[in-house]
Amino acid sequence: ECVTQLLKDTCFEGGDITTVFTPSAKYCQVVCTYHPRCLLFTFTAESPSEDPTRWFTCVLKDSVTETLPRVNRTAAISGYSFKQCSHQISACNKDIYVDLDMKGINYNSSVAKSAQECQERCTDDVHCHFFTYATRQFPSLEHRNICLLKHTQTGTPTRITKLDKVVSGFSLKSCALSNLACIRDIFPNTVFADSNIDSVMAPDAFVCGRICTHHPGCLFFTFFSQEWPKESQRNLCLLKTSESGLPSTRIKKSKALSGFSLQSCRHSIPVFCHSSFYHDTDFLGEELDIVAAKSHEACQKLCTNAVRCQFFTYTPAQASCNEGKGKCYLKLSSNGSPTKILHGRGGISGYTLRLCKMDNECTTKIKPRIVGGTASVRGEWPWQVTLHTTSPTQRHLCGGSIIGNQWILTAAHCFYGVESPKILRVYSGILNQSEIKEDTSFFGVQEIIIHDQYKMAESGYDIALLKLETTVNYTDSQRPICLPSKGDRNVIYTDCWVTGWGYRKLRDKIQNTLQKAKIPLVTNEECQKRYRGHKITHKMICAGYREGGKDACKGDSGGPLSCKHNEVWHLVGITSWGEGCAQRERPGVYTNVVEYVDWILEKTQAV
């Protein structure tokens, strides 16, 4: 059962796993949710009746029954983890805590103009978990405007104390706001020879990399595969760090793989969701339950629905035994990973999918697409929406992309002459315009947010957000697309598609069926040569064939330029402008979304 509200002046008795320090009960709940075993917590707020050394303690708890006895205690705030809930979860915490000093290892001290600048510094520093900033009113003159960057083993403060005229806060890496590089490559036959901060068992290097990503201290990792010569180290995932933030030594070793934490790409690739099945593999751990199941998929479902289950092993049924049902072993451990991994016993193992809700919805794999052809199939571009105007008549106005459950990203130039959001309707999950009838459900638009530097499409800033009146329930036919990570600026996208209901040539009609075209990206230098009379800025991105023939056109505006990278689709561009349509040596010009990620997050995450 999902319980989101906090219980004031209430303490849960027993079930303690560990104690951490958090600046608020709300953040304690987030820490509990991300902890592999925590189901409940008790937080102690500051209070004259409470010993100051206990202020800000967040006691993480577990219980076989998923609940614990309640005791009345002033200043105690208790609650449940969000593990039991089905909604999206985020560790992003933008709150600034006034007059609180969050203790940790102070490894960097510098002058900053504001707490915001200090927070940005922390976000862009590979080691930083949180910061404390001494304001200009701080009593000690030499400490005024000092920004202390801090880290700890757990990522949470080792203590929190009251201190006048300071403010503290967390790194915004988990809000996708870091400018740090996003290195997705996994290096085969490589060992990073740096200090280990932890080790866990993992079935493959991808899981190892994802574990590294959500481990607070891990910056890179080395994984020993099941063919690794030393038997005791097979399937071992070593979580590592270094002072520089990069591996100091790389050793060539066969059957080992190494890679980096995906902290700076976590909003555009899954880091919590281990959805694969591992055949002929047994995961060992504390047994939670043994249940009969028809298949390993059914076993995974059972594990996902059992809130304490972290991973499972399924042993298929012996012929004609137990109505063809096999045994499903639901398991857990102290850190969420198997205590040992064995091969050759015929089991099929995997992980709970409960943690998938901690990943951005946009990373979910979508239907395989039909290659070739110009008409799309249903569910092929589930983030594509058709934006309709109802004035003077109801018709398709522009394309757009779902980027959040209340947000559509589109082009600013679509709203020329649109005086009110009331005349707009957003239709999602649409393949054919002819499907849109009087009773077709749509999303009303609450607000149109146009970039305040926008003047005209050709001069840039052609970007707008639509805030919907109601939230989008994600399904196979309507779900978000990932924004590119700022750390991905140097990625060369090779699989890019433009989609829309727009014209197929300069004089044409809105298409009934959603059209698609694969289009190569063009460098800005090349694009500038083709548009001598315009300034192609770094905030624009171009795409097109030298010979022309495929391009976006009238009616496609605001729609996505979607590029697939590492099996995840990213919204690389917004259809903006061009000279004619599909003309030779006249590429289409798109708004370069990566350059507006901060703007998008600022507008969509504003309270």
Epitope: H388, T390, S391, P392, T393, Q394, R395, H396, Q433, S434, I436, K437, E438, W501, R504, R507, D508, K509, I510, N512
Partner: antibody, heavy 121, light 113 residues
Framework: EVQLVESGGGLVQPGRSLRLSCTAS????????MAWVRQAPTKGLEWVAS????????YYRDSVQGRFTLSRDNAKTTLYLQMDSLRSEDTATYYC??????????????WGQGTLVTVSS | QFTLTQPKSVSGSLRSTITIPCERS????????VSWYQQHLGRPPINVIY?????PSEVSDRFSGSIDTSSNSASLTITNLQMDDAADYFC????????????FGGGTKLTVL
């Protein structure tokens, strides 16, 4: 079931006026663009005029522009065509028609039974 | 303003297939959607094809529409011809660069033999 019922047709002298009405039922009238299409005896179809949902925008064929006025009353789910300065070439059966909900193209999804207008001295 | 030209009459025998063409005089046939209407004597028209090739749910799948850019014309095809298909058929399109200006073809009388 969509129903469009025209009325108001009849015999009228050239230069005089006539007002046609079309009462709609079976759909949300205020959500649709409506039109009049006419058909001269033993001749083809000819679009006359269209009006958007709230009546704020009207469209006419050139030969009736300035003589005909299209209006609607959404509360009464009724479409009107006020025809002034009638000419003999306006003689036709006048059909009330409903455009599609989504105007990504222009066509006539539903038609009424028609009302005959005869302009003759 | 363009015109849409249809043959005055077309005939076909019972259970055969017929095609009625509709040629656009200027501008590309593909620049705007073509619709088709069936009209029995003394009855109002019925929309049988819209948006080039889309069929309303209540219309028989024996009716299909297409456009051919090489001949700059649209076509209505009726397969497995029935006696009740005998009627006048009108094509209709518009100029997509002008707000509202539907244009009808002159109509084709279909006789079922």
């Amino acid at each position: 079931e969509v129903q469009l019922v025209e009325s108001g047709g009849g015999l009228v002298q050239p230069g005089r006026s006539l007002r046609l009405s079309c009462t709609a039922s079976g759909f949300t009238f205020s959500k649709y663009v409506m039109a009049w299409v006419r058909q001269a005896p033993t001749k083809g179809l000819e679009w006359v005029a269209s009006i958007n949902y709230d009546g704020s925008t009207t469209y006419y064929r050139d030969s009736v522009q300035g003589r005909f006025t299209l209006s609607r009353d959404n509360a009464k789910t009724t479409l009107y065509l006020q025809m002034d300065s009638l000419r003999s070439e306006d003689t036709a059966t006048y059909y009330c028609a409903r455009h599609p909900f989504n105007n990504f193209g222009i066509w006539f999804a539903y038609w009424g039974q028609g009302t005959l207008v005869t302009v003759s001295s | 303003q363009f015109t849409l030209t249809q043959p005055k009459s077309v005939s076909g025998s019972l259970r055969s297939t017929i095609t009625i063409p509709c040629e656009r005089s200027s501008g590309d046939i593909g620049d705007s959607y073509v619709s088709w209407y069936q009209q029995h004597l003394g009855r109002p028209p019925i929309n049988v094809i819209y948006a080039d090739d889309q069929r309303p749910s209540e219309v028989s799948d024996r009716f299909s529409g297409s456009i051919d850019t090489s001949s700059n014309s649209a076509s209505l095809t009726i397969t497995n011809l029935q006696m009740d298909d005998a009627a006048d058929y009108f094509c209709q399109s518009y100029d997509s660069n002008i707000d509202f200006n539907p244009v009808f073809g002159g109509g084709t009388k279909l006789t079922v033999l």
